[in-house]
């Protein structure tokens, strides 16, 4: 058992069916010594009397707020919340399994740039009674500081029959250095409870990898004279690290039909424009990458060839 | 939300099988854990068996382990609960529930009820 925070314990519960359980000893927070006894929840029932209470738990059912009273008179609290590991893994209920980039990736980051701030999401189909807080720090054995606000809901989808709600929260390493080799990882820890389960997610990350740019600003198109060819051109996004002289990126040219399925005209470069055949109701978009790390694509930035 | 309906009840002799069903409508019914229940007149409601959200873990109550069977089919939205050797003392309205903490034998733990069906037990 451990403390997740002030009156708050986590009994970490190794379950099979037949499991004996955790035996947890409850010590009620006063100088009183005489009197005293114990209720679980609302309930009336009296569990047991004297400072301590001794109980053995199995399942949910013996989670919850247990309070210590003397004479009608509350003395303190414990809420017992349950952290369940069924053969040998611990239980990953509350959030969804975003299955990218690969199998059990349950929070998913992302930075628009090297300034060391960066945005976490996951995604649950659990609409009440549902708490997050997120930890992070750069490397584990002697973590440096990162800061992160609050999660917060960030949207709502619904898929089929059922409600999806994402949360997200934003950190900022508190001393980053954006030109900066990265020896240690980031890592964010995401402690979820939900009712009375108590579950922990984490994620380890160099930012680097997690590179995102925003699309291209300013994207313009200038015909050329007696000819079917634009220039098509755009800018960095505000959002990128500067010096682009030495954070530079690479941008991908697209010329894309009104259907899918016509071929679609490619151009890279490292420039910020470029000249290429503008067809009939066809769309011109640009996307930006780390001109010296493969990391993410940005989104598409669009205009109509017209 | 996910509403469960139950249905199978029925009068039958002692020693006899008797497999009831809940049927779950509304949302991702893979997305909960499920119990039965049973209540007897005069008597708290009473845990009978859980199974988890997969289907992969089950949970029973002393009085019925080694008799009554839960299972689920998600691809049709149902639960069992298969009962045999059944006693007397088996008689009671028996609930479907659903909810989001596993193994739980206590019924607040269940967000959403059934109304339940009747299964009478004759000696």
């Known amino acids: 058992i451990w403390e997740l925070k002030k009156d708050v314990y986590v009994v970490e519960l190794d379950w099979y069916p037949d499991a004996p359980g955790e035996m947890v000893v409850l010590t009620c927070d006063t100088p009183e010594e005489d009197g005293i006894t114990w209720t679980l929840d609302q309930s009336s029932e009296v569990l047991g009397s004297g400072k301590t209470l001794t109980i053995q738990v199995k399942e949910f059912g013996d989670a919850g707020q247990y309070t210590c009273h003397k004479g009608g008179e509350v003395l303190s609290h414990s809420l017992l919340l349950l952290h369940k590991k069924e053969d040998g893994i611990w239980s990953t209920d509350i959030l969804k399994d975003q299955k990218e980039p690969k199998n059990k990736t349950f929070l998913r980051c992302e930075a628009k740039n090297y300034s060391g701030r960066f945005t976490c999401w996951w995604l649950t189909t659990i609409s009440t009674d549902l708490t997050f807080s997120v930890k992070s720090s750069r490397g584990s054995s002697d973590p440096q500081g990162v800061t992160c606000g609050a999660a917060t809901l960030s949207a709502e989808r619904v898929r089929g029959d059922n409600k999806e709600y994402e949360y997200s929260v934003e950190c900022q390493e508190d001393s980053a250095c954006p030109a900066a080799e990265e020896s240690l990882p980031i890592e964010v820890m995401v402690d979820a409870v939900h009712k009375l389960k108590y579950e922990n997610y984490t994620s380890s990350f160099f930012i680097r990898d997690i590179i995102k740019p925003d699309p291209p600003k300013n994207l313009q198109l200038k015909p050329l004279k007696n000819s079917r060819q634009v220039e098509v051109s755009w800018e960095y996004p505000d959002t990128w690290s500067t010096p682009h002289s030495y954070f530079s990126l690479t941008f991908c040219v697209q010329v894309q039909g009104k259907s899918k399925r016509e071929k679609k005209d490619r151009v890279f470069t490292d420039k910020t424009s470029a000249t290429v055949i503008c067809r009939k109701n066809a769309s011109i978009s640009v996307r930006a990458q780390d001109r010296y790390y493969s990391s993410s694509w940005s989104e598409w930035a669009s205009v109509p060839c017209s | 939300e996910v509403q469960p309906v139950e249905s199978g009840g029925g009068v039958v002799q002692a020693g006899e099988s008797l497999r009831l069903s809940c049927a779950a409508s509304?949302?991702?019914?893979?997305?909960?854990?499920m119990g039965w229940f049973r209540q007897a007149p005069g008597t708290e409601r009473e845990f009978v068996a859980t199974?988890?959200?997969?289907?992969?873990?089950?949970y029973y109550a002393d009085s019925v382990k080694g008799r009554f069977t839960i299972s689920r089919d998600n691809a049709k939205n149902t639960v069992y609960l298969q009962m045999s050797s059944l006693k007397s003392e088996d008689t009671a309205v028996y609930y479907c529930a659903a909810g989001w903490l596993y193994p739980s034998s206590r019924s607040r733990d269940y967000d959403y009820w059934g109304q339940g069906t009747q299964v009478t037990v004759s000696s």
């Open positions: 199974i988890n959200r997969r289907g992969s873990s089950t």
């Open positions: 509304g949302r991702s019914f893979s997305d909960y854990e």
